[in-house]
Interface confidence: low
């Protein structure tokens, strides 16, 4: 007899792991044999869909390789034309080990801003997400929270938040770890120690000190009255993200010195500035009152004769003192090409030390004249013959200009080293050096009528002369 369909085994909830097989059974009793159709989420499953296998006259539905998208309500419907159609439904719960679908990435962030490290996960049951910083589980606090999505949010990022992070997704089926990522916290440049203002005497050395920090470590530049510092020496050291810069200056004029700390954040820069003034006590322009100023010798004619980085007096009665004095010594130097080998080194030393006198910095920069004894040694001992010839020429008016006369001192007007040893300059080139004597040609003249300590009195002795330029 015809019989309407009856589903004898209603569908149940099926749990299946991804890539596993899942089977729904829909046993039907009826006569004639029913037609059985299947739906997923009310959408008909087509018989020729290769992801499914339908057997036993449609009573068995097998999902051959479960995907996470197969989750849903599956229904079977049986109809044989006798009575109405019958339906039974069951759920497929796709169980899934945790999977991190959007892992965290390296982040560079400026201190004080908000950082979000993403960590989006999949899994069934829904995984719980936690974070590890370094080697330890990250504890949430008022600034740090794991969002519903699994992402880590850090408010008001601090330097101590920098480090290595990874997220962990966990459910009953397993655990997934993200790769380790780096959170780098960048800090705007900040000056820790500003340079101090100074009030100093003319010609003093001053060191301005500026300390800055930041991430990355900033660079420090110095500005003098709005321009890059053109003189002075800068020493820098970096320790524990702190840069220390010292600018040593030789002060010949007042100025505003600015320390600028700069660091880079992506395409942008951050800067911090601090300024200090250097004023000169009882400042009056050297050109007006002091008749000159002290400066390091940076010419070329006397650089083998004067001490390295010698502080020399530049006479501001010339429009361009450095140039004029160099020209003066240059002109006279050329005349020394013809003098005797005995005279020449001594004359060069006298010439350079007379034109570029040693300078005593102070409120009033003061030239230190050559000691009379050294001048007389050149005149009467080393260069007696040449000196006489030169004086003769002078009397006869053979010199075209007075220039060379300015470069020859009048020994009698110079201070003696016996009056005040600090008031006059010695010529080390003429001092006897027992360790390293450089022998002059034998002298035939008798003992000079000057008293120079350490100058030997015998005619066979040696004198120390610093090497001078080759005049070829």
């Amino acid at each position: 007899l015809p019989k309407a369909p009856v589903i004898t085994t209603p569908l149940e909830t099926v749990d299946a792991l991804v890539e596993e097989v899942a089977t729904f059974m829909c046993a039907v009793e009826s006569y004639p044999q029913p037609e059985i159709s299947w739906t997923r989420n009310k959408i008909l499953i087509k018989l020729f869909d290769t992801r499914y296998s339908i057997r036993e006259n449609g009573q068995l539905l097998t999902i051959l390789s479960v995907e996470d998208s197969d989750d849903g309500i599956y229904c079977c419907t049986a109809n044989n034309g006798v009575g109405g159609a019958v339906e039974s439904c069951g759920a497929l719960q796709v169980k899934m080990k945790p999977k991190i679908t959007r892992p965290p990435i390296n982040v560079k962030i400026i201190e004080g801003l908000k950082a979000v490290l993403p960590c989006t996960t999949m899994g069934n049951p829904k995984p719980s997400v936690s974070w590890i910083k370094g080697d330890s589980p990250l504890r949430e606090n008022s600034r740090t929270a794991v969002l519903e999505s699994g992402s880590l949010r850090i408010h008001n990022v601090q330097k101590e938040d920098a480090g290595q992070y990874r997220c962990v997704a966990k459910n009953s089926l397993g655990t997934a770890y993200s790769k380790v990522v780096k959170l780098e916290v960048e800090v705007f440049a900040r000056i820790l120690r500003a340079p101090e203002s100074h009030n100093v005497t003319f010609g003093s050395f001053v060191t301005l000190h500026c300390t800055a920090t930041g991430i990355p470590v900033p660079t420090i530049t110095w500005i003098e009255n709005g321009n890059a510092v053109s003189s002075g020496s800068i020493q820098e050291s970096v320790k524990d993200r702190v840069i220390d810069s010292r600018l040593q200056l030789f002060i010949t004029k007042p100025g505003l010195y600015t320390c600028i700390a700069t660091n880079k954040h992506g395409e942008k820069f951050s800067t911090a500035k601090a300024a200090a003034t250097v004023s000169i006590a009882e400042w009056s322009k050297p050109q007006k009152d002091n008749k000159g100023y002290c400066a390091q010798y940076r010419g070329e004619v006397c650089n083998a004769v004067l001490a390295k980085d010698a502080l020399v007096f530049l006479n501001t009665s010339y429009a361009d003192p450095e140039e004029a004095q160099e020209l003066l010594v240059h002109t006279a130097w050329n005349e020394l090409k013809v003098v005797s080998p005995l005279c020449r080194p001594a004359a060069e030393a006298l010439l350079c030390n007379h034109v570029f006198q040693e300078c005593s910095p102070g409120v009033v920069p003061t030239p230190i004249p050559i000691c009379r004894e050294y001048c007389l040694a050149v005149k009467e001992l080393f260069c007696a013959k040449e000196w006489l010839a030169m004086e003769e020429k002078t009397h006869r008016g053979l010199y075209r200009s007075e220039m060379h006369l300015l470069s020859v001192p009048e020994c009698s007007k110079l201070p003696s080293m016996h009056w005040d040893p600090t008031a006059c300059a010695r010529l080390p080139h003429l001092d006897y050096n027992k360790e390293n004597p450089k022998t002059f040609p034998p002298m035939t003249s008798s003992k000079p009528s000057v008293d120079i300590p350490n100058l030997p009195s015998s005619s066979s002795s040696s004198f120390s002369v610093s090497p001078t330029y080759s005049m070829t």
Epitope: G226, N227, S231, E300, V301, A304, E323, M471
Partner: antibody, heavy 121, light 112 residues
Framework: ELQLVESGGGLVQPGGSLRLSCAAS????????MSWVRQAPGKGLEWVSA????????YYKESVKGRFTISRDNAKKTLYLQMNSLKSEDTAVYYC??????????????WGQGTLVTVSS | QAVVTQEPSLSVSPGGTVTLTCGLS?????????PDWYQQTPGQAPRGLIY???SRHSGVPSRFSGSISGNKAALTITGAQSEDEADYYC????????????FGGGTKLTVL
């Protein structure tokens, strides 16, 4: 009449060497500083090197330091530029120039006509 | 390394006045840079015009004068003539740890 005559230019392969000379006449050579200045085809002037009157010190543009050597022989009244490890960017007309005698680097008050150096493979 | 800047090109009418300038990419040009000016006509070697800011080389006409104006060196040609059409270069002495001499990129002056 003051004259500066450069020689020694030519075609050289990258990595090669050349020695330029500049013969001076008509002035007291050993009283003046000298310089080499170059000019790439269609480009501006570029200071290369300088030497004072006595050869006591030498100065170079940063990009040629360690490759070029300036020297002078005052007896022969000649300035030299030894160029090693030449690069294509060294291609230029090289001028020898006399300094005006001021300290530091001084103006260049007399120039030679130049010698062409071509660095190419 | 500081860059020396000049106007790429300028023009002047015969008899007119033109000022060429020479600046520094970072900072001001001062007399301590001893600004020098050179003239170069096509196919010729350069020739010195002005040295140390405002001094004329011998044989240079008085219509060429040098100065420092504001934060730049300046070359002024007063009463320009057709033969003044040339490239003009400034040269600056630099001292920042080591001595250096740097030319500007040059100004092409056209006398219309």
């Amino acid at each position: 009449e003051l004259q500066l005559v450069e020689s020694g230019g030519g075609l050289v392969q990258p990595g090669g060497s050349l020695r330029l000379s500049c013969a001076a006449s008509g002035f007291t050579f050993d009283d003046y500083g000298m310089s080499w200045v170059r000019q790439a085809p269609g480009k501006g002037l570029e200071w290369v090197s300088a030497i004072p009157w006595n050869g006591g010190s030498t100065y170079y543009k940063e990009s040629v330091k360690g490759r070029f050597t300036i020297s002078r022989d005052n007896a022969k009244k000649t300035l030299y530029l030894q160029m090693n490890s030449l690069k294509s960017e060294d291609t230029a007309v090289y001028y020898c120039a006399k300094r005006s005698g001021r300290i530091a680097f001084g103006a260049l008050d007399a120039w030679g006509q130049g010698t062409l150096v071509t660095v190419s493979s | 390394q500081a860059v020396v800047t000049q106007e790429p090109s300028l023009s002047v009418s015969p008899g007119g006045t033109v000022t060429l300038t020479c600046g520094l990419s970072s900072g001001s040009v001062t007399s301590s840079n001893y600004p020098d000016w050179y003239q170069q006509t096509p196919g010729q070697a350069p020739r010195g015009l002005i040295y140390s800011t405002d001094s004329r080389h011998s044989g240079v006409p008085s219509r060429f004068s040098g100065s420092i104006s504001g934060n730049k060196a300046a070359l002024t040609i007063t009463g320009a003539q057709s033969e003044d059409e040339a490239d003009y270069y400034c040269g600056l002495y630099m001292y920042s740890g080591s001595k250096n001499y740097v030319f500007g990129g040059g100004t092409k002056l056209t006398v219309l």
